[in-house]
């Protein structure tokens, strides 16, 4: 079975790599525009130059193309704690990231928020903080992990998951209460 191709892909596949089929004349293959430029006018005929123009400030194309417009540069989302790692150029989009000692949490494929790396107070670092993952902490005895922080077992209620980890402490507290009521 032949995979389904979109109209643009069908048209491009007729021409050799680096060229595209003229939209008005399918016997002509025009040279694609270099990255950093966009298509202003198709080539007038075989072997003639495509009219490519450089992207204006605030826009870019990152690969060879026959786009009629450059793509708008992304803006880093301050409200998500993002900072600009490198600014947009005609051939590369803005690169956004997080500050030192922060990691990215992706809420969706194209949306991330910066959060502070956990310090593992009352625990030890099992895995260091990475670009896209928080520190993994292991808690000391008498503490359990809640929202990636080591919390005292005295804050563990019986209904919570922590009861397994804090069972000896909970039993101790119960035992002390029992002995006080005799």
């Amino acid at each position: 079975l032949v995979p389904h191709l979109g109209d643009r892909e069908k048209r491009d596949s007729v021409c050799p790599q680096g060229k595209y089929i003229h939209p008005q004349n399918n016997s002509i293959c025009c040279t694609k525009c270099h990255k950093g430029t966009y298509l202003y006018n198709d080539c007038p005929g075989p072997g003639q130059d495509t009219d490519c123009r450089e992207c204006e400030s605030g826009s870019f194309t990152a690969s060879e193309n026959h786009l009629r417009h450059c793509l708008s540069c992304s803006k880093c989302r301050k409200e998500m704690g993002q900072v600009e790692i490198s600014s947009c150029t005609v051939d590369r989009d803005t690169v956004c990231g997080c500050r030192k000692n922060q990691y990215r949490h992706y809420w969706s494929e194209n949306l991330f928020q910066c959060f502070n790396c956990s310090l593992c107070l009352n625990g030890t670092v099992h895995l260091s903080c990475q670009e896209k993952q928080n520190t993994v902490c292991t808690c000391h005895a008498g503490f359990f992990l809640r929202e990636n922080e080591c919390v005292s077992c005295s804050n563990c209620k019986k209904s919570l998951e922590c009861t397994k980890l804090c069972l000896p402490q909970i039993e101790n507290v119960k035992g002390t209460e029992d002995s006080g009521t005799t």
Partner: nanobody, 119 residues
Amino acid sequence: EVQLLESGGGLVQPGGSLRLSCAASGFTFKNKTMVWVRQAPGKGLEWVSHIDQEGEGTYYADSVKGRFTISRDNSKNTLYLQMNSLRAEDTAVYYCALLPKRGPWFDYRGQGTLVTVSS
């Protein structure tokens, strides 16, 4: 005490519209980025849209772009989500929430309002 109360959900036919509201209290609304998230039956939470303090910076998930509009009225401490051209896949409980600060979980979100898109 932070309180977020959503309203405006209901049953609507495909292609129809709804406007969700979220009344906020217990914090300085005008200083906070606000978020709409949703949870479809048997699925996890999905980030739908957010809006910054001034209402200038907005974000939309690809699945709702061009159909949903987020807005806010800081004088009324209210967040809105205008939903047009609704589809069956938009069926979910919609929650308004404060942008998380400490980590990737929602410390403050409302009880939700159910949106059902069906003919």
